[in-house]
């Protein structure tokens, strides 16, 4: 009896695992084995596919074959008993195009109100993703074990910290990888659960902000208790993206070690151009808080977002304000690379009632003023980019008297 060729061959590639599955064409024939050949693009000869010769089941693994994952290959299969079936040819495919991203590895650490998630590619030193290692982004779904209400967090990297959680609560999460450059979305990891600890005696510092004054950065934060000491650390933001590395070498800011105030000042030259993460920790000598939320700090934006410089031309019922580029030391103007919005606040010198104008233009009219009255003006700049969402500090207030009535020039 002629053996029939196997049918419905499926190629499943997850990371570096190459699996073939097929259907027997004739269930009634026993003791049949199956063998595969492969052919690379531009070759005429067929080569035996190691790992997939004389297989008795309907599944085989050819992961050991060292293929160029970007090169198209063709497969063929036949059934064998005393005689052999004809070859059944599988549509040619490119492994990289066909490959799915496997579930990532997840490692969790718990604090009282935060969880640190470390994510690694499921296959270490993967050949399939060798050129894409740094391009992986991850997304996760997290929920309280008790409620099941899910929250999704997109576009995270190999280390992510989730804050504002409840103490002594079990949270569960699952993570999947994506290679957006190749339009690939991966498979979710198994569910991992961890319980946050009892509430710590000392809360972490909050509301960390960086501003620029002269040639210095000023870092400020809020804290609940007095008589504390604080330390500040920084990390290059790109290190969160390094897939295999889960040793984060946070560095001390020397001028912000054991400070007794809720701010510290350090020279701008501490940081080269780049994006950094900053965090603050509090201590009362006996106990230490967990680290604060990590804030992103971009030196380019921070440096350029100096308060605006402006001139006032006074009329009887209005001010004309002309905004110029802020000056660095040495009176050289700073070049603003980012589109800015200006917030102008003005008030009558004898009153506390402030009025606000938001303007994109650099020449602004402040209307409806009283003649011969002293008004004060201060301004600050905001980036228009939602992601960056930075603001300069306010400029020093400038006070001017409006002209007598009926002056329009």
């Amino acid at each position: 009896k002629n053996l029939k060729s196997p049918q419905k061959v499926e190629v499943d590639i997850i990371d570096d695992n190459f699996i073939l599955r097929w259907n027997r064409s004739d269930e009634s024939v026993g003791n049949v084995t199956f063998s595969f050949d492969y052919q690379k693009t531009g070759m005429d000869n067929w080569i035996k596919l190691s790992g997939c010769q004389n297989i008795t089941s309907t599944k085989c693994n050819f992961s050991s074959l060292k293929l160029n994952v970007y090169e198209e290959i063709k497969l063929r299969i036949r059934a064998e008993k005393e005689n052999t079936s004809s070859w059944y040819e599988v549509d040619s495919f490119t492994p990289f195009r066909k490959a799915q991203i496997g579930p990532p590895e997840v490692h969790l650490e718990a604090e009282d109100k935060a969880i640190v998630i470390h994510i690694s590619p499921g296959t270490k030193d993967s050949v399939m993703w060798a050129l894409d290692g740094l391009s992986f982004t991850y997304s996760l779904v997290i929920w309280k074990n008790s409620s099941g209400v899910e929250e999704r967090i997109e576009n995270i990297y190999s280390r992510h910290k989730i804050y504002k959680l409840s103490p002594e609560t079990t949270y569960c999460l699952k993570v999947k990888a994506a290679l957006l450059t190749s339009w690939k979305i991966g498979v979710y990891s198994p569910v991992h659960c961890i319980k946050t600890t009892v509430e710590n005696e000392l809360p972490p510092p909050e509301n960390i902000e960086v501003s620029v004054q002269n040639q210095n950065y000023v870092l400020k934060w809020d804290y609940t208790y007095a008589n504390m000491t604080f330390q500040v650390q920084w990390l290059h933001a790109f290190l969160k993206r390094n897939p295999g590395n889960h040793l984060y070498k946070w560095k001390q800011i020397p001028d912000c070690e054991n400070v007794k105030t809720t701010q510290c000042v350090f020279p701008q030259n501490v940081f080269q151009k780049g994006i950094y993460l900053l965090r603050v920790q509090a201590s009362d000598g006996n106990n230490t808080s967990f680290w604060s939320e990590e804030i992103k700090f971009d030196t380019e934006i921070q440096a350029f977002l100096l308060p605006p410089v402006f001139n006032i031309r006074s009329l009887s019922d209005s001010f004309h304000i002309y905004i110029g580029a802020p000056k660095q030391s040495g009176n050289t103007p700073v070049i603003q690379d980012y589109p800015l919005i200006y917030e102008i606040i003005f008030w009558e010198n004898t009153s506390n009632a402030e009025r606000k104008i938001i303007e994109k233009k650099t020449d602004v009219t402040v209307p409806n003023l009283k003649p011969l009255t002293v008004y004060c003006v201060k301004a600050r700049a905001h980036t228009m980019d939602e992601k960056l969402n930075k603001s300069s500090v306010f400029s020093d207030a400038v006070c001017e008297k409006t002209k007598p009535g009926n002056t329009s020039k």
Epitope: E111, H118, T197, E201, L247, K249, N286
Partner: antibody, heavy 118, light 107 residues
């Protein structure tokens, strides 16, 4: 294969100094933290300090500040522990340890025995 | 400094038994705790890290649990080769600190 090869046992006079070395193979010390840990006979483990060989930044237990100095030579993939003004309290085995992912002390040298004689 | 207290200096157990070694931190250290095993005449080896993760190659009879201030290393089905001293260590804050150790003796 990751290995930490420590220098041989030392017998030194009280008041003198000693420099212990630890040569790493199978990895680049710049990518890790390198720690030194002290263990006295029948006693527990005591962390002395660590270095980030990438930039030389060090951290010490306050009681070892001034007593111990940790340095690194990235060209030879070697870390050093200098101990000075030695007393009998410094008689111990000193371990060189790699600080790896998740800050775990994942590889330990074989230990160097230091005996301080009066 | 954070003090790690291992109240039991010695623990006696039999092959096949289950034994739990405990460690208490003087303040909340999250799950930033590791356990090390030191066999007689050898260097210590990491067994558990991040409170509950088994290090590569460590048999699954070793499990770690706990968070905050209370931590436990459990060895189920104790084997003769588990005769060793076990140390806990916190790495939440500098200076890093170890417990004083618990010696496991096998009857």
């Amino acid at each position: 294969e990751v290995q930490l090869q420590q220098s041989g046992a030392e017998l030194v006079k009280s008041g003198a100094s000693v420099r212990l070395s630890c040569t790493a193979s199978g990895f680049n010390i710049k990518d890790y933290y390198m720690h030194w840990v002290k263990q006295r006979t029948e006693k527990g483990l005591e962390w002395i300090g660590r270095i980030d060989p990438e930039d030389g930044e060090t951290k010490y237990v306050p009681k070892f500040q001034g007593k111990a100095t940790i340095t690194a030579d990235t060209s030879s993939n070697t870390v050093y522990l200098q101990l000075n003004s030695l007393t009998s309290e410094d008689t111990a085995v000193y371990y060189c340890v790699r600080g790896g992912n998740y800050y775990v002390m994942d590889y330990w040298g074989q230990g160097t025995s230091v005996t301080v004689s009066s | 400094d954070i003090v790690m207290t291992q109240s039991q200096k010695f623990m006696s157990t039999s092959v096949g038994d289950r034994v739990s070694v405990t460690c208490k931190a003087s303040q909340n250290v999250g799950t930033y705790v590791a356990w090390y095993q030191q066999k007689p005449g050898q260097s210590p080896k990491v067994v558990i890290y991040s409170a509950s993760y088994r290090y590569n190659g460590v048999p699954d009879r070793f499990t770690g649990s706990g968070s905050g201030t209370d931590f436990t290393l459990t060895i189920s089905n104790v084997q003769p080769e588990d005769l060793a001293e076990y140390f806990c260590q916190q790495y939440n804050n500098y200076p890093l600190t170890f417990g004083s150790g618990t010696k496991l003796e096998i009857k």
